[in-house]
């Protein structure tokens, strides 16, 4: 069977006026997954995103991440899109003071 991922979105200061938003998926099986940032509903081009390898996390499941740099104040236009085993979910960027968004996709 499949194990759905936990998805966690974080933000960190990058350069002046920019932030880096990172979307991490963990504890999923099988290893096939789509993880990408979307702006205004549409997937960003590959060259504006950085991906981590899909790696075993020691429990027979896998983990990976995707990050992109965006203008501060435009966070709400972005969502992390996750697709795994025929299911999808979307994950917005938390507001400034809160640094994570956990979602276990069913």
């Amino acid at each position: 069977g499949s194990v759905p991922p936990m998805v966690n979105v974080t933000r960190s200061e990058a350069s002046e006026g920019n932030i880096t938003v990172t979307c991490r998926a963990s504890s999923f099986y099988p290893r096939n997954i789509t993880l990408t940032w979307r702006q205004d509903g549409v997937s960003l081009s590959h060259d504006t995103q950085q991906w981590g390898d899909v790696l075993p996390d020691g429990n027979g499941t896998y983990q990976t991440w995707v990050a992109t740099r965006i203008c501060q104040g435009e966070e709400q236009r972005f969502t992390c899109y996750m697709e795994h085993s025929g299911n999808h979910s979307t994950h917005p960027v938390p507001s400034g003071n809160s640094h994570h968004h956990h979602h276990h996709h069913h």
Epitope: R38, G41, T79, N87, H88, P92, H103
Partner: antibody
Framework: QVQLQQSGAELVRPGTSVKVSCKAS????????IEWVKQRPGQGLEWIGA????????NYNEKFKDKARLTADKSSNTAYLQFSSLTSDDSAVYFC??????????WGQGATLTVSS | DIQMTQSPASLSASVGETVTITCRAS??????LAWYQQKQGKSPQLLVY???TLADGVPSRFSGRGSGTQYSLKINSLQPEDFGSYFC?????????FGGGTKVEIK
């Protein structure tokens, strides 16, 4: 301009199935998620689920997981909502909508479903 | 699931008056809130998104505000065409949930 054109009203018997359609035009159909919403008189609005028309991947409200099935046909730019084992509780207006990042920017006109013997 | 509590359920106001509708979320929704207007027999129309951004073509007499768990929609100088029902919806997490609605009647 962006348009979502839904199929017409349906009168169906309890226990049967029905398929509601939502034809998109004016934009790249496979680029945006399509959402489905249920509205019953006096009961407000309920999110049923969403489909990625490009891949067919779905996201269901747990409440509707065993009742609704979402599909999409890329060749005709049409999304579908199928219901099985219909009961009177399924009588409602069903809307499709486009997901523009983090809100629904365009809605279909609604399809009225009446389940009655 | 995040519950959205909207108030009042209905209101009656005169043309030119200012009215305010509120929505309270059961958890922090980080300003991922939209407001819709719906006329009888029609589909909802987007008014405000991200809690305070006006959708294209929406008159400036409408304004949204709020953060965390508390949000409001204000209509300045109510016009006859503003009658109908208003709904809030949160987009922080699925299932996306709606407020119960506010029916606005013109006196």
């Amino acid at each position: 301009q962006v348009q979502l054109q839904q199929s017409g009203a349906e009168l169906v018997r309890p226990g049967t199935s029905v398929k509601v359609s939502c034809k998109a035009s004016g934009y790249a159909f496979t680029n945006y998620l399509i959402e489905w919403v249920k509205q019953r008189p006096g009961q407000g609005l309920e999110w049923i689920g969403a489909i990625n028309p490009g891949s067919g991947a779905t996201n269901y409200n747990e409440k509707f997981k065993d009742k609704a099935r979402l599909t999409a046909d890329k060749s005709s730019n049409t999304a579908y909502l199928q219901f099985s084992s219909l009961t009177s509780d399924d009588s409602a207006v069903y809307f499709c909508a486009r997901f523009l990042g983090n809100y629904f920017d365009n809605w279909g006109q609604g399809a009225t479903l009446t389940v009655s013997s | 699931d995040i519950q959205m509590t909207q108030s009042p359920a209905s209101l009656s106001a005169s043309v030119g008056e200012t009215v305010t509708i509120t929505c309270r979320a059961s958890g922090n929704i980080h300003s991922y809130l939209a407001w819709y207007q719906q006329k009888q027999g029609k589909s909802p129309q987007l008014l405000v998104y991200y809690a305070e951004t006006l959708a294209d073509g929406v008159p400036s007499r409408f304004s949204g505000r709020g953060s965390g768990t508390q949000y409001s929609l204000k209509i300045n100088s109510l016009q006859p065409e503003d009658f109908g029902s208003y709904f809030c919806q949160q987009f922080w997490t699925t299932p996306y949930t709606f407020g119960g609605g506010t029916k606005v009647e013109i006196k």
